[in-house]
C-alpha cells in the first residue's frame, strides 16, 4: 500500500511541478523593472523568455516577441534550452509514469517492468527538475550581474545636465514559480525512485518446487535467504500486506521487497 501511495504522490507532485515549469516558461515576468528608485513609475517594463512587455498607467500593455534567434544573448538561449529540455523530459516522464502506476493495470505487465518504468520516470523527473532549477538560476544570476552593472552606471549624461535613467531589472514572479516547480518535480522524481525500490523484486524468483522426501513433503523455495522472507510461514505464498487477497495463481507473481517489511 505504501508503495502505491509513494508512487501516486510522486506522480501528482511531479505533475504539479511540470505544470509549474510549463507555466514559468510561458510567463512574461521573468524579470521586472526595479522600482526601488521610482516606485511610482508610469511605464512598467517586464520581460520573459520569449517577449518583453510594457504596461502603462493607462492600462495599455504592449508585448513584443524576440523575433531574432542569433541576436539574443547566449545565456537567454541556454535558459530557453534548459526549460524546454525540462518540459520535454517531464512530459515523457509523466507518460512513462502513467503506465508504471501500480494502481493501473495494463495487460499482464509484471512488477519488474513497472519498477523499471517507475525508476525511468523518476530519473526523468529528477533531471527535469534540475533543468528547470538550473535554467531559472542561470537567469537569476544574469539578472544580478546586469543589476549591479546598471547600478554602477545608473546615471549617464552630458556634464550631468541631462539624466538618462537606465532601467534596472529584478527577479520576476516566473523565477519563483520556476524554482518551486523545479523543486516539486525533483521531489516527485525522488519519490518515484523510492517507490521503484518497493516495486522491484529482490532476485529472480521461481515457482515453488516441491521435493518429496520419503516420510513427509517439504516445500522448498530457492533464493529466500533473508530472515524476513517469511520462509515457512506463508506456505500459500499469499501477499502479506493485503491480507492474502491475491494468490500465486493471480497476475501478481513476484513478491517485492516491500511486501515483507
Amino acid at each position: 500500500m505504501a508503495v502505491t501511495a509513494c508512487q501516486g504522490l510522486g506522480f501528482v507532485v511531479s505533475l504539479i511541478g511540470i505544470a509549474g515549469i510549463i507555466a514559468a516558461t510561458c510567463m512574461d515576468q521573468w524579470s521586472t523593472q526595479d522600482l526601488y528608485n521610482n516606485p511610482v513609475t508610469a511605464v512598467f517594463n517586464y520581460q520573459g523568455l520569449w517577449r518583453s512587455c510594457v504596461r502603462e498607467s493607462s492600462g495599455f500593455t504592449e508585448c513584443r516577441g524576440y523575433f531574432t534567434l542569433l541576436g539574443l544573448p547566449a545565456m537567454l538561449q541556454a535558459v530557453r534550452a534548459l526549460m524546454i529540455v525540462g518540459i520535454v523530459l517531464g512530459a515523457i516522464g509523466l507518460l512513462v509514469s502513467i503506465f508504471a502506476l501500480k494502481c493501473i493495470r495494463i495487460g499482464s505487465m509484471e512488477d519488474s517492468a513497472k519498477a523499471n518504468m517507475t525508476l525511468t520516470s523518476g530519473i526523468m523527473f529528477i533531471v527535469s527538475g534540475l533543468c528547470a532549477i538550473a535554467g531559472v538560476s542561470v537567469f537569476a544570476n544574469m539578472l544580478v550581474t546586469n543589476f549591479w552593472m546598471s547600478t554602477a552606471n545608473m546615471y549617464t549624461g552630458m556634464g550631468g545636465m541631462v539624466q538618462t535613467v537606465q532601467t534596472r531589472y529584478t527577479f520576476g514572479a516566473a523565477l519563483f514559480v520556476g524554482w518551486v516547480a523545479g523543486g516539486l518535480t525533483l521531489i516527485g522524481g525522488v519519490m518515484m525512485c523510492i517507490a521503484c525500490r518497493g516495486l522491484a523484486p529482490e532476485e529472480t524468483n521461481y515457482k515453488a518446487v516441491s521435493y518429496h522426501a520419503s516420510g513427509h513433503s517439504v516445500a522448498y523455495k530457492p533464493g529466500g535467504f533473508k530472515a524476513s522472507t517469511g520462509f515457512g510461514s506463508n506456505t500459500k505464498n499469499k501477499k502479506i500486506y493485503d491480507g492474502g487477497a491475491r494468490t500465486e495463481d493471480e497476475v501478481q507473481s513476484y513478491p517485492s521487497k516491500h511486501d515483507y517489511v
Partner: antibody, heavy 118, light 113 residues
Framework: DVKLVESGGGLVKPGGSLKLSCAAS????????MSWVRQTPEKRLEWVAT????????YYPDSVKGRFTISRDNAKNTLYLQMSSLKSEDTAMYYC???????????WGQGTSVTVSS | DILMTQSPSSLTVTAGEKVTMTCKSS????????????LTWYQQKPGQPPKLLIY???SRESGVPDRFTGSGSGTDFTLTISSVQAEDLAVYYC?????????FGAGTKLELK
C-alpha cells in the same frame, strides 16, 4: 460619443473644501485610467491626480499630496476629486481626462472653475 | 521631477508656412522596454480644453491632419506643422508621460501675422 462633464467647482475660502465630479459617458468607464488636470489663470497646465483602472492605485504631485483625493465610482461612471485645505494657488480650471496608450490624455471635459479666495 | 522646456514661447507665422517648435526634457523620455518616447503634444484653442495631437513623440492621434508631425528622441523633441492653416492658431503644449509627476511645458503660442 465620448463625453466628460465636470461639476462641483465654485468660490471657496482658503482652508476650505470642495468636491469635484466628472460624469463619463460614451465609453466603458471601468476600462480606463482617469486623471484630473488643472489650468492656472496664467494658462499653465498642471497634472493633479491619476487613478488606475481598478482604482487600487492613485498618484498625486507633491503640491496636492495629502490634500486632494481622487476616487471613482464605476457603478455610476463618475470620477471624483475631493479637495481640502485649499490654497489660493489651487485657483484654476479643473479638467477631467481619460488616459490612453502612451499615457496620453485623449479626451478632456470642458472643465469646472475653482476659485480660492478670501 | 522632469522639467519640460518649450521654445519659442510664441511664434508669428503666415498661412502656408512651415513651423517647427521644440520641447526639451530634463531627463530622457525614452523607455528601453519598447523603445518608445513618452512625450505627448496637445493643441489648445482659445476657450477650449486641450486636444491630443501626438503621443509616443511621433504617433499621430486619429483625426489629426497629417500636416502635424512629431519627431525626436530622448530629451529633444519637435512638433512640425508643414503648412500652417488659420485653424492651427493655438497654444501647443508638450507633456512628459514617462514618469510621475506628469509635467507640461509652458506652451508655444502660434499667432498669425
Amino acid at each position: 460619443d465620448v463625453k466628460l462633464v465636470e461639476s462641483g467647482g465654485g468660490l471657496v475660502k482658503p482652508g476650505g473644501s470642495l468636491k469635484l465630479s466628472c460624469a463619463a459617458s460614451g465609453f466603458t468607464f471601468t476600462s480606463y485610467t482617469m486623471s484630473w488636470v488643472r489650468q492656472t489663470p496664467e494658462k499653465r497646465l498642471e497634472w493633479v491626480a491619476t487613478i488606475i483602472i481598478g482604482g487600487s492605485y492613485t498618484y498625486y504631485p507633491d503640491s496636492v499630496k495629502g490634500r486632494f483625493t481622487i476616487s471613482r465610482d464605476n457603478a455610476k461612471n463618475t470620477l471624483y476629486l475631493q479637495m481640502s485645505s485649499l490654497k489660493s494657488e489651487d485657483t484654476a480650471m479643473y479638467y477631467c481626462t481619460r488616459l490612453v496608450k502612451g499615457n496620453a490624455m485623449d479626451y478632456w471635459g470642458q472643465g469646472t472653475s475653482v476659485t480660492v479666495s478670501s | 521631477d522632469i522639467l519640460m522646456t518649450q521654445s519659442p514661447s510664441s511664434l508669428t507665422v503666415t498661412a502656408g508656412e512651415k513651423v517647427t517648435m521644440t520641447c526639451k526634457s530634463s531627463q530622457s523620455l525614452l523607455n528601453s522596454g519598447n523603445q518608445k518616447n513618452y512625450l505627448t503634444w496637445y493643441q489648445q484653442k482659445p476657450g477650449q480644453p486641450p486636444k491630443l495631437l501626438i503621443y509616443w513623440a511621433s504617433s499621430r492621434e486619429s483625426g489629426v491632419p497629417d500636416r502635424f508631425t512629431g519627431s525626436g528622441s530622448g530629451t529633444d523633441f519637435t512638433l512640425t506643422i508643414s503648412s500652417v492653416q488659420a485653424e492651427d492658431l493655438a497654444v501647443y503644449y508638450c507633456q512628459n508621460d514617462y514618469s510621475y509627476p506628469f509635467t507640461f511645458g509652458a506652451g508655444t503660442k502660434l499667432e498669425l501675422k
